[in-house]
């Protein structure tokens, strides 16, 4: 919807100047949880390699960081909750700043595209489903459009 | 494994020149079902408006090409099919036509980057689950180290 | 492979500052800490601070009211910035990467520093 | 602060012989966490150091295994099994498991 459109646009000018802030936020809340989880590690090894941030970096960085924060949301912070009484508040809030990060990168489109769908695709299947049985000769009957459209993607994709 | 990642740079190497012959194949499989379809289309107004090209010429263009050949391969091709016993082999030929496209924009990665996942992300989710009870101290203990990755993406993302 | 290349030394007037840079490639200052450390002519190594991956800082105590740690993980680099010097900060100033283990796996080839008027 | 003595000040050896560096703190260097942040390090002449020994006892990579680090607590000792004239230089015991970390005066290895 338009205000929706709107509040996104809001979203991406202010976002850039909003970071700092967003990452205190997320550090101050790890701060209060960092001795308890540091000191029970006692392996010298690391699990977030150099790799991780070249992946962050490189082409497939979105779908990386998509994938880090849903790993840390859903599978590390819900048993990291459970390791003492003393911390679970303080990891919760600390996975509610993520979520918030979260919220705010994708509302902002550019910064998490790949959880983002297109509208126009959207608009196709509704109204692929509206038209019933004619749909699928409409559909079909444009398959020629959509190869066209595919080669404007990919020649746009070799060009860059 | 190295033998993929060979395979995937020889796709990538070679795929700009196979273009022509890819598109051609799926325009000549659609041939033998175009005037079909589109003789039982009667609508005037398009279905695969202009705002789907700029879809995939967009930010979000791989998702939409990646949804739309889902769209045409799960939803339209399978209804298609049972149109009339004569088209079924060839509508089933074009579909393989668009998935042979489909795997090898897959395999060459800058094509179809949102159908990928980080190897970095699954090496540290392999990681945590071999590390079971000290993979949560570790992930946690290590999150100040994802905070400075998020911080790197979205810099990145700013600059860009 | 893993480089520290520190810059910013040469001849600084007494009661001056200092502003040294470590650039570093084969590696992220966003996953490593990085110390500093100094030597003065004929004298052993003396630490004098570390920043650390999230950006933290400690200090020596002898260091503290002067010394100053700094980084920036989009440019790969870390700061030392040191005021108020004297004849005895003459030295040659090292940084060193932090392993994850807590040691200094790598150094750099040191920078040199001398206060004289 | 830990201060960290290391004797002798200066050890000249013979080539092929065994040297042998002591490193005394002035206060237990066990971390919090468990782990003793101790660790050797060797200056050749005109050179940065070089990391040889960090965590008591583990070789850093690329090291040769003639040089060995043993102890805990308070007391700590590098050892070279057979000296070599590439080995010549000053070696540093240092803490990290207390700030301000603090390095050794030094240990001068020179051969006879």
């Known amino acids: 919807s338009p205000g929706q459109g709107t509040q996104s646009e809001n979203s991406c000018t202010h976002f850039p100047g909003n970071l700092p802030n967003m990452l205190r936020d997320l550090r101050d809340a790890f701060s209060r949880v960092k001795t308890f989880f540091q000191m029970k590690d006692q392996l010298d090894n690391l699990l977030l390699k150099e790799s991780l941030l070249e992946d962050f970096k490189g082409y497939l960085g979105c779908q990386a960081l998509s994938e880090m924060i849903q790993f840390y949301l859903e599978e590390v912070m819900p048993q990291a909750e459970n390791q003492d009484p003393d911390i679970k508040a303080h990891v919760n809030s600390l996975g509610e700043n993520l979520k918030t990060l979260r919220l705010r990168l994708r509302r902002c489109h550019r910064f998490l595209p790949c959880e983002n769908k297109s509208k126009a695709v959207e608009q196709v299947k509704n109204a692929f489903n509206k038209l019933q049985e004619k749909g699928i000769y409409k559909a079909m009957s444009e398959f020629d459009i959509f190869i066209n459209y595919i080669e404007a993607y990919m020649t746009m994709k070799i060009r860059n | 494994s190295p033998g993929q990642g060979t395979q995937s740079e020889n796709s990538c190497t070679h795929f700009p020149g196979n273009l022509p012959n890819m598109l051609r194949d799926l325009r000549d499989a659609f041939s033998r079902v175009k005037t079909f379809f589109q003789m039982k289309d009667q609508l005037d107004n398009l279905l695969l408006k202009e705002s789907l090209l700029e879809d995939f010429k967009g930010y979000l263009g791989c998702q939409a090409l990646s949804e739309m050949i889902q769209f045409y391969l799960e939803e339209v091709m399978p209804q298609a099919e049972n149109q009339d016993p004569d088209i079924k082999a060839h509508v089933n030929s074009l579909g393989e036509n668009l998935k042979t496209l489909r795997l090898r924009l897959r395999r060459c990665h800058r094509f179809l980057p949102c159908e990928n996942k980080s190897k970095a992300v699954e090496q540290v989710k392999n990681a945590f689950n071999k590390l079971q009870e000290k993979g949560i101290y570790k992930a946690m203990s290590e999150f100040d180290i994802f905070i400075n990755y998020i911080e790197a993406y979205m810099t990145m993302k700013i600059r860009n | 492979e893993v480089q520290l290349v520190e810059s910013g030394g040469g001849l600084v007037q007494p009661g001056g500052s200092l502003r040294l840079s470590c650039a570093a490639s084969?590696?992220?200052?966003?996953?490593?800490?990085v110390h500093w450390v100094r030597q003065s002519p004929g004298k052993g190594l003396e630490w004098l601070g570390v920043?650390?991956?999230?950006?933290?800082?400690d200090y020596s105590a002898a260091f503290m009211s002067r010394l100053t740690i700094s980084k920036d993980n989009s440019k790969n680099t870390v700061y030392l910035q040191m005021n108020s010097l004297r004849a005895e900060d003459t030295a040659v100033y090292f940084c060193?990467?932090?392993?994850?283990?807590?040691?200094?796996?790598?150094w750099g080839q040191g920078t040199s520093v001398t206060v004289s008027s | 602060d830990v201060l960290m003595t290391q004797s002798p000040l200066s050890l000249p050896v013979t080539l092929g012989q065994p040297a042998s560096i002591s490193c005394r703190s002035s206060?237990?260097?066990?971390?919090?966490?468990?782990?003793?942040?101790l660790e050797w390090f060797q200056q050749r002449p005109g050179q940065s150091p070089r990391l040889l020994i960090y965590?008591?006892?583990n070789r850093f990579s690329g090291v040769p295994d003639r040089f060995s680090g043993s102890g805990s607590g308070t007391d700590f000792t590098l050892k070279i099994s057979r000296v070599e004239a590439e080995d010549v230089g000053v070696y540093y015991c240092?803490?990290?498991?207390?700030?301000?970390?603090?390095f050794g005066g030094g240990t001068k290895v020179e051969i006879k």
């Open positions: 920043i650390w991956r999230g950006g933290s800082t």
């Open positions: 965590k008591v006892s």
């Open positions: 084969g590696f992220s200052f966003a996953t490593y800490g």
């Open positions: 206060q237990n260097i066990v971390h919090s966490n468990g782990n003793t942040y």
């Open positions: 060193a990467k932090q392993a994850y283990g807590h040691y200094m796996d790598y």
């Open positions: 240092f803490q990290g498991s207390h700030v301000p970390w603090t």
